[in-house]
Interface confidence: medium
């Protein structure tokens, strides 16, 4: 019996369409597939950022695949042909690997790239990113921010920069339609007459960097002789009530500090009839049902009761 062999795919390459990290891996069928016309050939593709311990593996019948990468590092990929067992009267046959790499030639020393990049999606409505200039760069250095997410035809440049001393140190983004729950890619590059500036690449998902507005309309209601219900409302904006967690800080007679985390817009507090003063504040955060991470809002305005019997009055702010 002659051993059945198959060639690796041809023209394996990684193509950068200019989407700041979202790359195309593509290839052509192997040579000499004529013997296997009745077979559906598959391809096993492995890829990773250089330095990563683990390969991502996919198997496909297609001649292309797309995924996101960290362009601060290089990318390596390898692919081989798979012949299913029914093509070979036995076990699956694999070709040797075809391999390729891709990286962006770095310009400038690492210290010239932006420092302390910070992006916040305020109230799930307004994205703002800020950064500090690179270490030791001159005042003639300016940074430019570009962004892309699936749905845009091409990468866009920031049109509303935040400036300090004539340098761009941040970007206020326009309305970003259908941009959450998908990878959001950013590149901040720079230019200087004196020395080349290193580019930086960032990837995140907008729902994970949301900072909500604080809750509003804090109220007290006496439920019984020893219970007071604290209530508040979700802030105005697009975030639905089911997406919030809350943290409450309660001070009773300037002595007791109670902190609690709750999922609803109410909290029942055990009190005594001797309570002379009660104050509370609340802050909000997007919960695990709507994101993987988030940023606590600022604390709400403080709501206090003092010097009057809580059983006789409902306080509304």
């Amino acid at each position: 019996d002659t051993e059945i062999k198959v060639n690796p795919p041809q023209d394996f390459e990684i193509v950068d369409p200019g989407y700041l990290g979202y790359l195309y891996l593509q290839w052509q069928p192997p040579l000499s597939l004529d013997h296997f016309k009745e077979c559906t050939v598959e391809y096993e593709l492995k890829y990773r950022n250089i330095g990563s311990e683990t390969w991502k593996t996919i198997i496909t019948k297609n001649l292309h695949y797309k995924d996101g990468f960290d362009l601060n590092k290089g990318i390596e990929a390898k692919i081989h042909t798979l012949l299913p067992w029914q093509c070979t009267n036995g076990s699956e046959v694999q070709s040797s690997w075809a391999e390729t790499t891709y990286w962006i030639s770095p310009q400038g020393i690492p210290e010239t790239k932006v420092q302390d990049m910070d992006c916040v999606y305020y109230n799930w409505q307004y994205l703002l990113c800020s950064w500090k200039p690179g270490i030791g760069v001159l005042l003639d250095t300016n940074y430019n921010l570009f962004y892309w997410y699936e749905g845009l035809d091409h990468a866009l440049q920031c049109v509303d920069y935040i400036k300090a001393d004539g340098q761009n140190i941040g970007c206020r983004f326009p309305y970003l339609e259908a941009s959450d729950y998908k990878d959001f890619y950013i590149c901040v590059n720079g230019s200087s007459e004196n020395k080349p500036i290193r580019s930086s690449y960032f990837t995140f998902q907008l729902q994970n960097i949301v900072k909500p507005l604080p809750p509003v309309y804090l109220t007290f209601t006496r439920e019984s002789s020893c219970e007071i219900k604290l209530k508040w409302s979700i802030p105005l904006g697009p975030i639905p009530a089911r997406c919030f967690d809350y943290e409450i800080e309660i001070r009773e007679d300037d002595t007791t500090l109670v902190t609690a985390t709750v999922e609803n817009e109410t909290y029942t507090l055990k009190t005594t009839n001797e309570t002379r003063q009660l104050c509370f504040v609340v802050r909000s955060k997007v919960n695990i049902y709507c994101s993987d991470d988030g940023i606590w809002s600022e604390w709400s305005d403080k709501q206090c009761w003092e010097g009057e019997d809580l059983s006789k009055k409902t306080l509304l702010r």
Epitope: T40, I59, P84, W85, Q86
Partner: nanobody
């Protein structure tokens, strides 16, 4: 760990319809394939249909072509099997399965070798 939960099975008369659902959880990838298999009493496991999460790629067994339709709702990580014009020979336990490495469906004849996560199964009985 991937969990697959099937629902929608039951007793139906010949010529009737059923819609099976398979909800998946516990995985991170956006790219995978999901398939339906069945096992009739005293018979081996048979591939019924497969769908890709990313591509417009579906396959069907010859015995169900034109009667069964597989579809997906990626937002819910759920795959459906709409079964019309049911016959007594469609009686079986129907299993949902997922392969998180594959992004396109293999040939139906090799399907059962490729899936790495399986549901518990739901009984479909076609009888008058």
């Amino acid at each position: 760990e991937v969990q697959l939960v099937e629902s929608g099975g039951g007793l139906v008369q010949p010529g009737g319809s059923l819609r099976l659902s398979c909800a998946a959880s516990g995985f991170a990838s956006d790219d995978y394939i999901m398939g339906w298999f069945r096992q009739a009493p005293g018979k081996g496991l048979e591939g019924v249909s497969c769908i890709s999460s990313r591509y417009a790629n579906t396959v069907y067994a010859d015995s169900v072509k034109g009667r069964f339709t597989i579809s997906r709702d990626n937002a819910k990580n759920t795959v459906y099997l709409q079964m019309n014009s049911l016959r007594p020979e469609d009686t079986a336990v129907y299993y949902c399965a997922m392969d998180s490495r594959r992004v396109t469906c293999p040939e139906i004849s090799t399907m059962h070798r490729n899936f790495d996560s399986w549901g518990q199964g739901t009984q479909v009985t076609v009888s008058s």
